[in-house]
């Protein structure tokens, strides 16, 4: 009876999410394997988040708009492990917007989700950021490694969206 009511709850939650995400990929989690964590198909999952690599070329503002239409934000990178996971799915000859910007050009970088900007957990390429006119951050492959670079916000780039996993 307990299992039955849990299944009914899950099904109604799935139906609720289905209007936003036609397909979800879920895995069983938790110590009793009773919780399901889901990401929209074909997003990838890492720890408690889902990621989507957008290959359409857009300005930073439009890229953030595009992520928010999908219930996400441009990616906020919190750890080297997270960055390493993300970069497995990126093309080395492309650049991708991050959810990091310096709106006034005062070198006050801020994440889209208001996560505090911690200089000790940043992965700028050597010599970057290097221009107060370049107020948005990308991740790209340079000198044999992935890192961040500041760029002009209005020049179209690919992007990465991130959202919290859906728990049902």
């Amino acid at each position: 009876n307990f299992m039955y009511s849990k299944t009914v709850k899950r099904l109604s939650k799935l139906q609720e999410y289905q209007q936003y995400y036609p397909s979800l990929t879920c895995v069983m989690e938790g110590k009793d394997m009773e919780d399901w964590s889901c990401c929209p198909t074909p997003w990838t999952s890492f720890q408690s988040s889902c990621y989507f690599i957008s290959t359409v070329m857009q300005s930073w503002t439009k890229s953030q708009n595009n992520c928010s239409v999908m219930g996400a934000d441009l990616v906020v990178i919190n750890t080297k492990e997270e960055q390493d996971f993300i970069t497995q799915n990126l093309k080395i000859n492309s650049a991708y917007f991050l959810g990091l910007s310096d709106p006034k050009g005062w070198r006050h970088w801020q994440w889209v989700d208001q996560t505090p900007y911690n200089k000790n957990v940043t992965f700028w390429h050597s010599g970057e950021p290097n221009s107060p006119d370049e107020r948005c951050a990308i991740i790209n492959f340079r000198s044999e490694e992935w890192g961040w670079n500041d760029v002009h916000c209005h020049v179209p780039q690919k992007s990465i969206c991130k959202m919290k996993k859906i728990y049902i």
Epitope: Q58, S59, K62, V151, H154, V155, P156
Partner: antibody, heavy 120, light 107 residues
Framework: DVQLQESGPGLVKPSQSLSLTCSVT?????????WNWIRQFPGNKLECMGY???????YYNPSLKNRISITRDTSKNQFFLSLNSVTTEDTATYFC?????????????WGQGTLVTVSA | DIQMTQSPASLSASVGETVTITCRAS??????LAWYQQKQGKSPQLLVY???TLADGVPSRFSGSGSETQYSLKINSLQPEDFGNYFC?????????FGGGTKLEIK
Amino acid sequence: DVQLQESGPGLVKPSQSLSLTCSVTGYSITSGYYWNWIRQFPGNKLECMGYISYDGSNYYNPSLKNRISITRDTSKNQFFLSLNSVTTEDTATYFCVRGGDYDDGGFAYWGQGTLVTVSA
Amino acid sequence: DIQMTQSPASLSASVGETVTITCRASGNIHNYLAWYQQKQGKSPQLLVYNAKTLADGVPSRFSGSGSETQYSLKINSLQPEDFGNYFCQHFWIIPYTFGGGTKLEIK
């Protein structure tokens, strides 16, 4: 004020390459924005062909991908269009255009255009 | 690619009249739409960006409106200098495609 000016041969033979130059004054092409080639066919249809960004990166319209190259000479503040294996279908007026104005919401700066005819 | 369908293809009107040109996108372009005017032998001139914001120096008789996939350009009290070709262009995702154009002629 930024100004763009196209130049190049007005007549190209089929199967040859079309080469055009855009000279930019009033703004350095390495300082910002992205620098487009747009063409207008005889029936007035407009097509974005591709661009070179201020940082040197490129985008090419997939419909032209194997034939197009956009390069630049930063010392002369010029950028170039090369289109290979042209046919009569490439007859058009070619414009160079600055991209990225109004947070990339509209193209405010255009060259005056140069007509290229592809004919034997 | 997003396709832009513009109508009408041509339009005859008299000085002082009001005309409306419409543009339909094949997908939601989130108000990232521009309108241009082009005179014979000249390059297109930006009139409106972000669907409804007038570019610098554009007279207030021009106005843009719309949302999602449907947009329009309205010209109130047509002036002789308003005759020519008009194009819409979306700016949502690259490649930014244009409508087929509307030829506005004097009746």
